[in-house]
Amino acid sequence: SERCDDWGLDTMRQIQVFEDEPARIKCPLFEHFLKFNYSTAHSAGLTLIWYWTRQDRDLEEPINFRLPENRISKEKDVLWFRPTLLNDTGNYTCMLRNTTYCSKVAFPLEVVQKDSCFNSPMKLPVHKLYIEYGIQRITCPNVDGYFPSSVKPTITWYMGCYKIQNFNNVIPEGMNLSFLIAFISNNGNYTCVVTYPENGRTFHLTRTLTVKVVGSPKNAVPPVIHSPNDHVVYEKEPGEELLIPCTVYFSFLMDSRNEVWWTIDGKKPDDIPIDVTINESISHSRTEDETRTQILSIKKVTSEDLKRSYVCHARSAKGEVAKAATVKQKVPAPRYTVELACGFGATGGGSGKPIPNPLLGLDSTHHHHHH
């Protein structure tokens, strides 16, 4: 049949490989789009066909599987490059078909160059290690399937440009790199170079990942609301702008969703008929502890608004907390001339000194928030 289920260009699978290294690329059809695997498809008489479009070209062309030393080959649902070349960059399509069925998907392949310190346009996976937590390991990624278990490759580990040797707390152990205890100074890019023989040739795989040292679960605490707090009173006159920051500290927790929100009289701000805006900013410490600030703003506050309950809430995997802001309507200070006149009247024209107004001792703004 002429019709073919075309899944389009699968940009989620932006495959990047290093130049002059082997690459094995599985047809994404069986991983993401179809409910059966290659073996089932093959048994059912379906054929897997590969073709490609070169970078900056529109013309689809077959892949040349007759290159010297079988540089490009297909094995089951895997397209092999032994090794890649820079001009292999392009969009690759795998199509599964027989006379009655057809399904295809394309994906981009980018062959990238690395410099002498392994820097490249490659998007690096990030591996998080807990600070001062005990022995933790990273493993050289994406090397499965390149050589049989009978082949024992050699591995060299680098941190940045430098071979890892005689580091106090980092020990290469074959495919693994062990951190006896992780410190902030261990942040950086780590590269494993894997060398293995195959059919009378030697191949190399280079894999780089970023290590980020983060807060340990041993030190994790529930969210801490720094503001609002009991020391700050938000005292406003009607018509003034009311700004209340909610600043919350979250310990780093792997895969935890940190949330901050305001309620006004127990409801979400959107459900209250007042013109309220909330702006959020987020900052992180070196160990990825997070500080979130949500500033609740009412441009022209009314006396009704000043009677409402404003509560900041925070939640993480460690728990949920809430804190109410103390909001008051400012009591207008008596005007100076009136006060003076009352003073004279009361004393029968005494010393001429104004009577102290106890209200003037209060800070009427009480804005201790940070933008």
């Epitope: 290093f18 130049e19 002059d20 290294e21 090794p83 070349l85 820079l86 160059q113 690395k114 410099d115 002498s116 310190c117 392994f118 050699t154 591995i155 060299t156 680098y158 071979k163 040797q165 005689n166 170079v193 060398t195 030697t202 190399h204 280079t206």
Partner: antibody
Framework: QVQLQQSGAELARPGASVKFSCKAS????????MQWVKQRPGQGLEWIGT????????RYTQKFKGKATLTADKSSSTAYMQLSGLASEDSAVYYC????????????WGAGTTVTVSS | DIKMTQSPSSMYASLGERVTITCKAS??????LSWFLQKPGKSPKTLIY???RLVDGVPSRFSGGGSGQDYSLTISSLEYEDLGIYYC?????????FGSGTKLEIK
């Protein structure tokens, strides 16, 4: 297959400079280090330095800093070594050799270039 | 710089004999050691890398071993084409340094 073709023998006067080449073929020139090694007549091997043609990064042994300069031309897949201020002790065979990161730093060798310094 | 001490400096052996050459580094080189064979008038040929890994195409009668500072190259049964000068090289750190060589001749 991988080959390193070194330029022919050089005869030079003391104090002069000489530049010789190592042309690579059969692999991606910019992905491997190029090592350079000196061997005086009847003597052992001596590592001079290395260059990564991908970005031009070089490393030298202290003795050859200022004496040897390593360069690479990506367009022609050719590595060069220039020796300056030539003296009789620079008379030797100079080899280039391909190497990768970490594990296999020397795999394929060139045939060598003979440099003779004589007045 | 790391100093590589190779021994013996020369040796005689019979064809079919088992031959062992050693190399000692002035400090731990973490198995970053290669062995080379140079025949008269030829460029060196790489035999072994990372102390015990045979380069493709090198006969299996060659084997390497060792760790820390001490390394060895063994030829299980000497053949005529194995004659020449053997060099070790440390590449644990820059500058790379070669051993002084072992000349292997027929007894």
């Amino acid at each position: 297959q991988v080959q390193l073709q070194q330029s022919g023998a050089e005869l030079a006067r003391p104090g002069a400079s000489v530049k010789f080449s190592c042309k690579a073929s059969g692999y991606t020139f910019t992905s491997y280090w190029m090592q350079w090694v000196k061997q005086r007549p009847g003597q052992g091997l001596e590592w001079i330095g290395t260059i990564y043609p991908g970005d031009g990064n070089t490393r030298y042994t202290q003795k050859f800093k200022g004496k040897a300069t390593l360069t690479a031309d990506k367009s022609s897949s050719t590595a060069y070594m220039q020796l300056s201020g030539l003296a009789s002790e620079d008379s030797a065979v100079y080899y280039c050799a391909r190497g990768y990161f970490g594990n296999l730093v020397f795999d394929v060798w060139g045939a060598g270039t003979t440099v003779t310094v004589s007045s | 710089d790391i100093k590589m001490t190779q021994s013996p400096s020369s040796m005689y052996a019979s064809l079919g004999e088992r031959v062992t050459i050693t190399c000692k580094a002035s400090q731990d080189i973490n198995t970053y050691l290669s062995w080379f064979l140079q025949k008269p008038g030829k460029s060196p040929k790489t035999l072994i890398y990372r102390a015990d890994r045979l380069v493709d195409g090198v006969p299996s009668r060659f084997s390497g071993g060792g760790s820390g500072q001490d390394y060895s190259l063994t030829i299980s049964s000497l053949e005529y084409e194995d004659l020449g000068i053997y060099y070790c090289l440390q590449y644990d750190e820059f500058p790379y340094t070669f051993g002084s060589g072992t000349k292997l001749e027929i007894k």
